[in-house]
Interface confidence: low
């Protein structure tokens, strides 16, 4: 029977600059229950704060709700790992959350062959920025990735489309059928899942020819 | 610019009250936990006090624990410490922080 | 008596570098990040370096911060006359400030 191991705090997120979670890596449990603390303060502050919410992200987790969380502030944290014969602590973590958010994907991707008769066709490829996030603020840019391949192909092909929420992609395999899908990142974070593929049928009759 | 105007202190008698006062501007004041430090004629610092945003949360140290009280009125943008039952040890200068800085001038309490 | 232990007194000469210590234990100094203040002659403190080694807008390179494991340490180079001072070393467990007892630093 010894002291816990130390724990690692090895990743923190936030999907909108509004709330975000913390997640720790229990160290070796020394063969006895162990109790886990996750304790906080903010850069230039003073009060020493314990986790508000262990719940809602699941085992060895801290939630800070919306009240908690603070743009432009670091968080510096640590957890606590006690159990009857001592305690251990992670290194501090240093967490601003204007580097960690990773939004939800983005939403309603719609796509559209179109084939004007006075250009070349493409295809149209629509979308939505995630619901959590508030662009009208100003200081939240999103860009956006779009990745498509035909059904039965290994290899995505992709686009950057920038801040754009549309995009137009003119060279297309005729007759296959593509898969596409859309991602977002901040331009100071991470980058969020794909969405769900949405299936497009390329007609036969589609051309590429300049 | 930020700034912490202590006011308030005075030569009071053993077992007397007095309330001092800390008015802050530059900064938006309930963004931010308060404290009060204080320091004996030619010694060192002594934590007194704090105070969170909100008022929900306050600390102090058990030198002072029962007979000082902080507040703050966030609508004045003023930071209080209300002391009772004063004692000759309690003979400071009394500051007040915004965080860990900066700090006022302070206010000289002579018991 | 203050928990966190640092010398009464340093000297040094203009151009030389001086270290002020602070120790205390693993309860204290090791499970806490440490602040330093500055408190020049008839003047408030000032914060020098928080969160160990971190130095706000407008202190000088030539203070640095360190900790390791139950001490920390203040680091002035190039020392200058301005820098005759009172030095005080602080942590917040729980909730509570606790600075360590006063370093009176002389430039000779």
């Known amino acids: 029977q010894l002291p816990p191991g130390k724990p690692e705090i090895f990743k923190c997120r936030s999907p909108n600059k509004e709330t975000f979670t913390c997640w720790w890596r229990p160290g070796t449990d020394g063969g006895l229950p162990t109790n886990y603390s996750l304790t906080y303060h903010r850069e230039g502050e003073t009060l020493m704060h314990e986790c508000p919410d262990y719940i809602t992200g699941g085992p060895n987790s801290c939630h800070f709700g919306k009240q908690y969380t603070s743009m432009w502030r670091t968080y510096i944290m640590m957890v606590n790992a006690t159990n009857q014969m001592g305690s251990s602590f992670s290194d501090e973590l240093y967490v601003d959350v204007t580097y960690i958010v990773q939004p939800d994907p983005p939403l309603e991707l719609a796509v559209e062959v179109k084939q004007p008769e006075d250009r070349k066709p493409y295809l149209w490829i629509k979308w939505s920025p995630p619901t959590l996030i508030d662009l009208k603020t100003g200081w939240f840019t999103l860009l956006y990735e779009i990745r498509l391949k035909p059904e039965k192909a290994a290899e995505w092909e992709i686009h950057f489309a920038g801040q754009q929420t549309e995009f137009k992609i003119l060279s297309l395999h005729p007759g296959q059928k593509y898969l596409v899908q859309v991602r977002c990142k901040p331009d100071h974070g991470y980058w969020s899942a794909w969405s769900p593929a949405t299936f497009i049928q390329i007609p036969s009759d589609f051309t590429m020819n300049d | 610019e930020v700034q912490l105007l202590e006011s308030g202190g005075g030569l009071v008698q053993p077992g007397g009250s007095l309330r001092l006062s800390c008015a802050a501007s530059g900064f938006t004041f309930d963004d931010y936990g308060m404290s009060w430090v204080r320091q004996a004629p030619g010694k060192g610092l002594e934590w007194v006090s704090l105070?969170?945003?909100?008022?929900?949360?306050?600390y102090y140290a058990d030198s002072v624990k029962g007979r000082f009280t902080i507040s703050r009125d966030n609508s004045k943008n003023t930071l209080y410490l209300q002391m009772n039952s004063l004692r000759a040890e309690d003979t400071a200068v009394y500051y007040c922080?915004?965080?860990?800085?900066?700090w006022g001038q302070g206010t000289l309490v002579t018991v | 008596q203050s928990v966190l232990t640092q010398p009464p007194s340093a000297s040094g000469t203009p151009g030389q570098r001086v270290t002020i210590s602070c120790s205390g234990s693993?309860?204290?100094?090791?499970?806490?990040?440490v602040n330093w203040y500055q408190q020049l002659p008839g003047t408030a403190p000032k914060l020098l370096i928080y969160d160990n080694n971190k130095r706000p807008s407008g202190v000088p390179d030539r203070f640095s911060g360190s900790k390791s494991g139950t001490s920390a340490s203040l680091a002035i180079s190039g020392l200058r006359s301005e820098d005759e001072a009172d030095y005080y070393c602080m942590i917040w467990p729980s909730n509570a400030w606790v600075f360590g007892g006063r370093t009176k630093l002389t430039v000779l």
């Open positions: 105070i969170s945003w909100d008022g929900g949360s306050t």
């Open positions: 693993s309860s204290n100094i090791g499970s806490n990040t």
């Open positions: 922080t915004r965080g860990f800085d900066p």
